[in-house]
């Protein structure tokens, strides 16, 4: 027979606590049963009758063993900048978290009360510290030799490409433009080989210099109009 033989309600021995999932009712001066998560106390215990529990109504919950007279109300529906990561059930409150591209500017015990969009670093600036669930992006100016030509909350400053001969020097918001002096492949005189434009380059989370071709026979078009390369025929 298990040691826990006394049935609730019962008067505890002096100096003894109630047992597992029980509470001491000050009025009845008895150890009584708690209600399980998802329930609440409909009728409190007396000296002769135990707690009567009832299920929480819709949109209300209790997460813990309890003897509360009413269940707690679930929080309001998630706003448009949030996603519901946990639904309101009889045993748990609704949890709203910020959707991608947003961070929690004002948190609550579980989830987020107020979301804000992640800061976007403008051209010439890169991400110094990425955004997290609870902190905004920190931008920094691109250091000499690096650039960012995007308005982005994720792009970092990337190194300028290394040219044998520079056609247009890079700056904080534009990559260097190289010109070819001794092409390594046979090309028609004055022909220029154009690879993918910068905007389709893969973004790195760490500043990893791209391998340079030696000697370079290409350049990358900067964003927006640019002067024709030396030896090009133009349009």
């Amino acid at each position: 027979l298990p040691a826990q033989v006394a049935f609730t309600p019962y008067a505890p021995e002096p100096g003894s606590t109630c047992r597992l999932r029980e509470y001491y009712d000050q009025t009845a001066q008895m150890c009584c049963s708690k209600c399980s998560p998802g329930q609440h106390a409909k009728v409190f215990c007396t000296k002769t009758s135990d707690t009567v529990c009832d299920s929480c109504e819709d949109s209300t919950y209790t997460q813990l063993w309890n003897w509360v007279p009413e269940c707690l109300s679930c929080g309001s529906r998630c706003s448009s900048d949030q996603v519901e990561t946990q639904a309101c059930t009889r045993e748990q409150n609704r949890i709203c978290t910020c959707r991608p591209g947003w961070y929690c500017a004002l948190s609550k015990q579980e989830g987020c009360r107020l979301c804000a969009p992640l800061r976007k670093c403008r051209p010439g600036f890169g991400v110094a510290r990425p955004g997290t669930e609870t902190s905004d992006v920190v931008c920094k100016p691109c250091a000499p030799g690096t650039f960012s030509n995007t308005t982005s909350s994720t792009d970092i400053c990337r190194p300028h490409q290394i040219c044998n001969v520079v056609a247009i020097p890079g700056n904080a918001s534009m990559d260097a433009v190289c010109t070819s002096t001794s092409p390594t492949r046979s090309m028609a005189p004055g022909a220029v080989h154009l690879p993918q434009p910068v905007s389709t380059r893969s973004q790195h989370t760490q500043p990893t210099p791209e391998p340079s071709t030696a000697p370079s026979t290409s350049f990358l078009l900067p964003m927006g109009p640019s002067p024709p390369a030396e030896g090009s025929t133009g349009d």
Epitope: P2, A3, Q4, P12, G15, S16, T17, R19, L20, R21, K34, L64, W65
Partner: antibody, heavy 119, light 107 residues
């Protein structure tokens, strides 16, 4: 962070008593039970009982009833377990552990106190 | 008192293995089953409570299942730091009781 720090090792003679302390930090001491669990060398774990620091009330494993006393000093967030009439079988590592009375688990444990009973 | 019995006292496995440790209660304990990890010289750690609820900070490779009298702790992909002794414990009825422990060793 939540921590339980226990007193140092003890060597006692049969028939004597031992008192082990457990200092809590990182949470509100009076709101959680402090349990005591022991482990004899190469053996499993055995629950001794708990004390509720808010009022000092206790709950014991009947195997230890009459030999164990649990007390607390809320001003220094410390719980104590005293075991009397020691015998060689009481040689063990004694742990304090913070308990949850709804699910019956122990979520934070002390580092353990070795008690050796030898003549 | 409720007796808790592990299916084996020791178990050999390799890093990356899926490991299951089982525990049987001498009577129905509903879902009130907790799992702990113990390493030599370290504090005991709660892994799982109420059969399947993961304690905060515990890696998701640990999971618990079962009900009534038979319970299982599963480690989906064994990591080097998982070699330890594992204990089950019932939280259904006083006195609270532990199983004898299963020592997980490197194969």
């Amino acid at each position: 962070q939540v921590q339980l720090v226990q007193s140092g090792a003890e060597v006692k003679k049969p028939g004597a008593s031992v008192k082990v302390s457990c200092k809590a930090s990182g949470y509100t001491f009076i709101t959680y039970d402090i349990n005591w669990v022991r482990q004899a060398t190469g053996q499993g774990l055995e629950w001794i009982g708990w004390i509720y620091p808010r009022d000092g009330n206790t709950q014991f494993n009947e195997n230890f009833q009459g030999r164990v006393t649990m007390t607390r000093n809320t001003s220094i967030s410390t719980a104590y377990m005293e075991l009397s009439s020691l015998r060689s079988e009481d040689t063990a590592v004694y742990y304090c552990a913070r308990g949850d009375r709804d699910y019956g688990y122990f979520d934070v444990w002390g580092q353990g106190t070795t008690v050796t009973v030898s003549s | 008192d409720i007796q808790m019995t592990p299916s084996t006292s020791s178990l050999s496995a390799s890093v990356g293995d899926r490991v299951t440790i089982t525990c049987r209660a001498s009577q129905d304990i509903s879902n009130y089953l907790n799992w702990y990890q113990q390493k030599p010289g370290k504090a005991v750690k709660l892994l799982i409570y109420f059969k399947s609820k993961l304690h905060s900070g515990v890696p998701s490779r640990f999971s618990g299942s079962g009900s009534g009298t038979d319970f299982t702790l599963t480690i989906s992909s064994l990591q080097p730091e998982d070699f330890a002794t594992y204990y089950c414990q019932q939280g259904n009825t006083l006195p609270l009781t532990f199983g004898g422990g299963t020592k997980l060793e490197l194969k």
